[in-house]
Amino acid sequence: CKAMHVAQPAVVLASSRGIASFVCEYASPGKATEVRVTVLRQADSQVTEVCAATYMMGNELTFLDDSICTGTSSGNQVNLTIQGLRAMDTGLYICKVELMYPPPYYLGIGNGTQIYVIDPEPCPDSDF
């Protein structure tokens, strides 16, 4: 297993609809044809897997059907979007990139993106 640098933004604020997007960029040392991207969430020293996808260069990322993540790839950049977020989902979201093929296997883990989620205020009652 060889190490690889992964860069991602330090902070992202989710939209009022609970959607957060960020770019995960990796420094590929070779010409990988199969890349696996995993998003991990770290909160209160607990790390959980949010979503994962393997893509072949030139194709879109394919997440599980019930995944809260979507994404696109362009070269060594992955544009990730996480939806359905609520205030309780605020935390550090870490991008993990694995170059699966061809050998050798490379692994890179970003420093994480702190995603802040603020639940929208309920609309006040209307007299109309």
Partner: nanobody, 117 residues
Framework: AVQLVDSGGGLVQAGGSLRLSCAAS????????MAWYRQGPGKERELVAS???????AYTDSVKGRFTISRDNAKNTVYLQMNSLKPEDTAVYYC???WGFGDYGSWGQGTQVTVSS
């Protein structure tokens, strides 16, 4: 893991066509992606074409407009239609199935394609 069986290779003259098939032992509908790689004499294995679960396709530049990848989920089979073949397409062609959720996927055994000039 799903087992893959490649077939359809053979000897063909330049300009001819071949259709490769990759039959899977189980359902391919949930696979992240399926692809064809090839390895020419003295060369590294290279990605030729891929197709995702959603049907998105991608091709290496040298085969664009000549090769077409497709999948038939009902038959659990992936195809590579190769037209206008060139001598430089000579290689062993391997089918590849990719999961991506804690699995490295599967390879077919390979099928030889030889294009004579």
């Amino acid at each position: 893991a799903v087992q893959l069986v490649d077939s359809g290779g053979g000897l063909v003259q330049a300009g001819g066509s071949l259709r490769l098939s990759c039959a899977a032992s189980g359902s391919i509908s949930s696979l992240n992606a399926m692809a064809w790689y090839r390895q020419g004499p003295g060369k590294e294995r290279e990605l030729v074409a891929s197709i995702t679960r959603g049907g998105s396709t991608a091709y290496t530049d040298s085969v664009k407009g000549r090769f077409t990848i497709s999948r038939d989920n009902a038959k659990n089979t992936v195809y590579l239609q190769m037209n206008s073949l060139k001598p430089e397409d000579t290689a062993v062609y391997y089918c590849r199935a990719v999961w991506g959720f804690g699995d490295y996927g599967s390879w077919g055994q390979g099928t030889q394609v030889t294009v004579s000039s």
